[in-house]
Interface confidence: low
């Protein structure tokens, strides 16, 4: 049998696994789709992105609201043509998430 | 131009983005490769998995050490033939990570 305490522990863990904004490491270059002769240092930044589990397999954890936060990064051209320049880079930061259908459903389905 | 304080902020962010064990939400059924008529509640658990950035594109963040932690979950069979049972499920937990080459290199390369 199982006691209340065990159920509480399981419930707490479940709450923590659910779809919500989570701090994630994203690669700036692929995020911005920059040309190959320009790269950023550091190459990655921490932002919040939607992640976690949904109750049903037909649902996916998606962002419902997004803000853009500015990160100071070095933009470097290859070959190095100048002192690396500090530039503000805007990166998407998910502020709200929801479990949504993976594809739009037919209105009659 | 940039001052020391700005560089310190960038440096701290970079440290946090680097390859290390990070709390991640994993789906138990796909983790254990269970049959489709058995599923778990909650379907997901939190464990540490290697994630983050590596300095070079040729490197990938990989686990170098793993422990297995036991999570108490409800195992449910479909169709429901009995009261859902609490079972201990062992899930891989990454305890060490390293940036390693994506594919083994030829000794002479």
């Amino acid at each position: 049998f199982y006691d209340i305490e065990t159920l509480k522990v399981i419930d707490e863990e479940w709450q923590r696994t659910q779809c919500s904004p989570r701090e994630t490491c994203v690669e700036v270059a692929s995020e911005l789709g920059k040309s190959t002769n320009t790269f950023f240092k550091p190459p990655c930044v921490n932002v919040f992105r939607c992640g976690g589990c949904c109750n049903e397999e037909s649902l996916i954890c998606m962002n419902t609201s997004t803000s853009y936060i500015s990160k100071q990064l070095f933009e470097i051209s290859v070959p190095l043509t100048s002192v690396p320049e500090l530039v503000p880079v805007k990166v998407a930061n998910h502020t709200g998430c929801k479990c949504l259908p993976t594809a739009p459903r037919h209105p009659y389905s | 131009f940039y001052d020391i304080e700005t560089l310190k902020v960038i440096d701290e962010e970079w440290q946090r983005t680097q390859c290390s064990p990070r709390e991640t939400c994993v789906e138990v059924a796909s983790e254990l490769g269970k049959s489709t008529n058995t599923f778990f509640k909650p379907p997901c658990v939190n464990v540490f998995r290697c994630g983050g950035c590596c300095n070079e594109e040729s490197l990938i963040c990989m686990n170098t050490s793993t422990s297995y932690i036991s999570k108490q979950l409800f195992e449910i069979s479909v169709p429901l033939t009995s009261v859902p049972e609490l079972v201990p499920v062992k899930v891989a937990n990454h305890t060490g990570c390293k940036c390693l080459p994506t594919a083994p290199r030829h000794p002479y390369s």
């Epitope: 320009t38 240092k41 550091p42 070095f74 933009e75 051209s77 070959p79 190095l80 043509t81 100048s82 002192v83 690396p84 320049e85 500090l86 530039v87 | 131009f1 940039y2 020391i4 560089l7 310190k8 960038i10 440096d11 970079w14 300095n55």
Partner: antibody, heavy 117, light 112 residues
């Protein structure tokens, strides 16, 4: 507060190798994006950039002098060393150590190196 | 290499009067990222160079507002609206758009 100080011989003979040390404080060369470099100025003449070294050990040299220059760092000692081989009287100059930002904000006081037999 | 040509070589000035120094580069200093890395330094007698203006027209902190920078592409100017006795020294322009980073030959400003 950022400070940089150059040290090395005041006099070197032609064909000898010059070794200059830059000891700095107020920042760390292990900090992301940080660089230290060397610039020289012959008496009464223009400034000339020589070399610099970055936090990640990347090094850049003035192409004209590349074959004669070597720059290295000792992060734990907060030092950067520049060596210049085959010194000639035309290399007589004040050698400055700089913190490499865009532009150069912090400079050492400079050390005068005379090349003479 | 980018050649930086400064004029005049010497500039005798009267305190309270304006002064202007020109700097011309052998090639455009507009970087691929759109910035122009043209800077001005002042080297007072017996001292290291000190930054006055960065990226054409931005005054460095603590620099009096009588100093201003302007220009684009290959032609740049440093202006002192009213020269003071403490402004004497050698003024250098510098570019860090292209490697190797280069400096102008200098303009010596002295009081008449």
């Amino acid at each position: 507060q950022v400070t940089l100080k150059e040290s090395g011989p005041a006099l070197v003979k032609p064909t000898q190798t010059l070794t200059l040390t830059c000891t700095f404080s107020g920042f760390s060369l292990s900090t992301y994006g940080m660089g230290v470099g060397w610039i020289r100025q012959p008496p009464g003449k223009a400034l000339e950039w020589l070399a610099n070294i970055w936090w990640n050990d990347d090094k850049y040299y003035n192409p004209v002098l590349r074959s004669r220059l070597t720059i290295s760092k000792d992060t734990s000692k907060n030092q950067v060393v520049l060596t210049m081989t085959n010194m000639d009287p035309v290399d007589t100059a004040t050698y400055y150590c700089v913190q490499v930002t865009n532009p150069f904000v912090f400079w050492g006081e400079g050390t005068l190196v005379t090349v003479s037999s | 290499d980018i050649v930086m040509t400064q004029t005049p070589l010497s500039l005798p000035v009267t305190p309270g009067e304006p002064a202007s120094i020109s700097c011309r580069s052998s090639q455009s200093l507009v970087h691929i990222n759109g910035n122009t890395y043209l800077h001005w330094y002042l080297q007072k007698p017996g001292q290291s160079p000190q930054l006055l203006i960065y990226k054409v027209s931005n005054r460095f902190s603590g620099v009096p507002d009588r100093f201003s920078g302007s220009g684009s592409g290959t032609d740049f100017t440093l202006k002192i609206s009213r020269v003071e006795a403490e402004d004497v020294g050698v003024y250098f322009c510098s570019q860090s758009t292209h490697v190797p980073w280069t400096f102008g030959g200098g303009t010596k400003v002295e009081i008449k």
